[in-house]
Interface confidence: medium
């Protein structure tokens, strides 16, 4: 049978499984909505003062790292069906590429997209983030990209493994270190050069940087201060631009989009690794 | 047999198990040393400028939350020995109190104390935290108290359960919410009053507040500015005191010690719950 026919068949079956066992999907949606409302309530109505900087950075950091850690569950995608995959592949049901793409399109794509949409729709308006349509969609897109790259990493680690727990542990350790290098817990400009290159392997760093660039640009955080006069506040962070520069974030448009490019590259690399591991798996089955 | 004899017997056996299976203990020590060195390298030589505020807050937050999340493993203390405990209790080997206290003294006490000592000894000097002996020991004591209260909470949740995973999941969810209310990701002074009471149930909040009070008091963060005069800028955070006030932290000595009192109360409450659950368990065995 053709690749398209196999792809349609795998996607259909995966989608049916998803709809046939709606508890998991519904539970995930409910948890996301509840968490979104809790975060919205905690950070409700962000102010434009020094607490506004801390709270904006805090909530964007939380959303980014939450997208990462909740993507750990993606390790199950290929692990739980490992034996079935090997059996069906050997029986000639489908190519590895059909199975791989089918699972991604029917399972990973919708289940990682939903939380990003839900979080953005709830949190954005409850918090009163930048009231601009483009900024709203950039945030949604960024959270999706973080979720996809984290899930892709999960697949790359877990594909071909029989035990979920080892992959989960490895993922969690990776994300803890990535979280340190994301740019909230440590100012990335202060890390020694022999260590700072590690930031470029951090998924949440790209997501957090993009979200900050998107939210902070054009904001004022010193209400009533005439920033154009002789400002005695050398040490104050009075504008979003000043905050971003202090974090070592490039203010240009490329300073925003290069993060999405990096996440896209990571997705491609991790999915390639996952695919190769599945290929490798069937050779040795 | 007397309570003391039973206590000595349980403690001796637990301690022998610990020494007879040294891999776990040694692994924990190695992991702690490595993590301490990594954190020390990332934050090496904190500066006294605006990045110094961010990095100090970041590392203290990480140490506090790490103490919490690594204490989740304490759920295993009573769970893995549940059947053995019921069998031996029914056989009249010991009272519940002897078993409970014996396990705490021989297992929980040393294994939760070590990481606090190791972290403080490595991190304190690599980072160049406040060069005062009392501040060093306050930090060590605070990390110990956080570890003990988090472990006590783990015991309270897990005691009498047969499956580790459920208790672990429940603990993790609790710590995620506690982490939000710890005071880095959100400025606690900005949370609505109908929600802000939740901060008083947050273990990392007490630890983080104590560590910040201990480290920030008496620091200057605006190099070249005479911070003793009236700071002409309301918007800059030029002293540790200004930073603490913005975080809603009481500058008095009680502002430090009340956190340890709260953690001590939590330890007592959680251990009481754990003990009662073990008593309840043997009644229904």
């Amino acid at each position: 049978t053709s690749f398209c026919h196999q792809l349609r068949w795998v996607s259909k079956r995966s989608f049916k499984n998803l709809l046939g066992n709606p508890q998991a999907s519904i539970a995930q949606i409910i948890v996301t909505v509840v968490l979104g409302l809790v975060i919205g309530a905690i950070y409700f109505g962000l102010k434009n003062d020094s607490t506004g900087i801390q709270n904006r950075a805090g909530v964007l950091f939380f959303l980014t790292t939450n997208q990462c850690f909740s993507s750990v569950s993606a390790v199950e995608l290929f692990v739980v069906e490992k034996k079935l995959f090997i059996h069906e592949y050997i029986s000639g049901y489908y190519r590895v590429s059909s199975y791989f793409l089918g699972k991604l399109l029917s399972d990973l794509l919708p289940m990682r997209m939903l939380p990003s949409i839900i979080f953005t729709c709830i949190v954005y308006f409850m918090l009163g983030l930048k009231p601009k349509a483009d900024a709203f969609f950039v945030m949604m897109f960024t959270l999706m990209m973080v979720a996809y790259s984290a899930s892709s990493m999960a697949l790359a680690i877990a594909a071909g493994q029989s035990v979920v727990s080892v992959a989960t542990l490895l993922m969690t350790i990776c994300f803890v270190f990535m979280m340190i290098f994301s740019g909230l817990l440590v100012n990335l400009t202060t890390i020694a050069s022999w260590l700072s290159w590690l930031q470029y392997f951090s998924i949440p760093r790209y997501g957090f940087t993009a979200l900050q660039h998107n939210e902070f640009l054009g904001q004022n955080f010193c209400p009533g201060l005439n920033a154009t006069g002789n400002n005695p506040c050398n040490y104050a962070t009075c504008t979003g631009e000043e905050y971003l520069v202090k974090q070592g974030i490039d203010l240009s448009p490329w300073g925003l989009w290069k993060n999405h490019v990096a996440l896209a590259c990571m997705i491609v690399i991790f999915l390639t690794i996952a695919y190769l591991k599945l290929l490798f798996l069937k050779k040795y089955s | 047999t007397s309570f003391c004899h039973q206590l000595r017997w349980v403690s001796k056996r637990s301690f022998k198990n610990l020494l007879g299976n040294p891999q776990a203990s040694i692994a924990q020590i190695i992991v702690t040393v490595v993590l301490g060195l990594v954190i020390g390298a990332i934050y090496f030589g904190l500066k006294n400028d605006s990045t110094g505020i961010q990095n100090r807050a970041g590392v203290l937050f990480f140490l506090t939350t790490n103490q919490c999340f690594s204490s989740v493993s304490a759920v295993e203390l009573f769970v893995v020995e549940k059947k053995l405990f019921i069998h031996e209790y029914i056989s009249g080997y010991y009272r519940v109190s002897s078993y409970f206290l014996g396990k705490l003294l021989s297992d929980l006490l040393p294994m939760r104390m070590l990481p606090s000592i190791i972290f403080t000894c490595i991190v304190y000097f690599m980072l160049g935290l406040k060069p005062k002996a009392d501040a060093f020991f306050v930090m060590m004591f605070t990390l110990m108290m956080v570890a003990y209260s988090a472990s006590s909470m783990a015991l309270a949740i897990a005691a009498g359960q047969s499956v580790v995973s459920v208790a672990t999941l429940l603990m993790t969810i609790c710590f995620v919410f506690m982490m939000i209310f710890s005071g880095l990701l959100v400025n606690l002074t900005t949370i609505a009053s109908w929600l802000s009471w939740l901060q008083y149930f947050s273990i990392p909040r007490y630890g983080f507040t104590a560590l910040q009070h201990n480290e920030f008091l008496g620091q200057n963060f605006c190099p070249g500015l005479n911070a003793t005069g009236n700071n002409p800028c309301n918007y800059a955070t030029c002293t540790g005191e200004e930073y603490l006030v913005k975080q809603g932290i009481d500058l008095s000595p009680w502002g430090l010690w009340k956190n340890h009192v709260a953690l001590a109360c939590m330890i007592v409450i959680f251990l009481t719950i754990a003990y009662l659950k073990l008593l309840f368990l043997k009644k229904y065995s």
């Epitope: 054009g218 154009t228 504008t239 070592g248 490039d250 240009s252 | 070249g224």
Partner: antibody
């Protein structure tokens, strides 16, 4: 408080080299993200950005004048310099220096120094 | 390209100045006011963000290549030269607009 003050020769002859100094206080050119730019304004005309120097010594020049401009700094004395060799009358203008954060617009300006190129 | 080069207005009028870039500049536009013998003063950055101290009668808008600056209710103290600045790629000022009283 942040202040910037430009100083220059006032009047100089064509083909001579124009040397300008910007002395500043209230900030340091070693602070992450801080840069200083030179901008000029010929009499009755618009503003023209010339050159920029940053904390880590990166330099940028107006592409149309790049070959003629040299910007430098003396961090210990809180000064930034601009050199324009072989000037002509078209270089007559008020020269301003301004403090800038990265590529953020200029919030802090000096009062300007008038340079007249005349034979 | 900034237009118009000069503008006459009566007190209380609404005036608008436009700036068109040769390519997409992603909202990286600032607006300055300059009074005779004085250095320029930053009024608006990032297309529409008013600097602290800028009266609310001043506003900015735009995207991609086209940007505008408005004064909703002209006062005598607003009589000055106005410049747009793009800062997406180095810095380029517009040619300026002279605002005069009718």
């Amino acid at each position: 408080q942040v202040t910037l003050k430009e100083s220059g020769p006032g009047i100089l002859r064509p083909s001579h080299t124009l040397s300008l100094t910007c002395s500043f206080s209230g900030f340091s050119l070693t602070t992450y993200g801080i840069c200083v730019s030179w901008i000029r304004q010929p009499s009755g005309k618009g503003l023209e950005w010339l050159a920029n120097i940053c904390w880590e010594d990166s330099k940028a020049y107006n592409p149309s004048l790049k070959n003629r401009l040299t910007i430098s700094k003396d961090t210990s004395n809180n000064q930034v310099f601009l050199r324009i060799p072989s000037v002509d009358t078209a270089d007559s203008a008020i020269y301003y220096c301004a403090r800038v954060f990265n590529n953020y617009p200029f919030p802090y300006w000096g009062q300007g120094t008038l340079v007249t190129v005349s034979s | 390209t900034q237009s118009p080069p000069s503008l006459s207005a009566s007190l209380g009028d609404k005036v608008t100045i436009t700036c068109q870039a040769s390519q997409n500049i992603n909202k990286y536009v600032a607006w300055y006011q300059q009074k005779p013998g004085k250095a320029p003063r930053l009024l608006i950055r990032y297309t529409s963000t008013l600097e602290s101290g800028t009266p609310s009668r001043f506003s900015g808008s735009g995207s991609w290549r086209d940007y505008s600056f408005s004064i909703s209710n002209v006062e005598s103290e607003d009589i000055a030269d106005y410049y747009c600045l793009q800062y997406v790629n180095l810095w380029t000022f517009g040619g300026g607009t002279k605002l005069e009283l009718k």
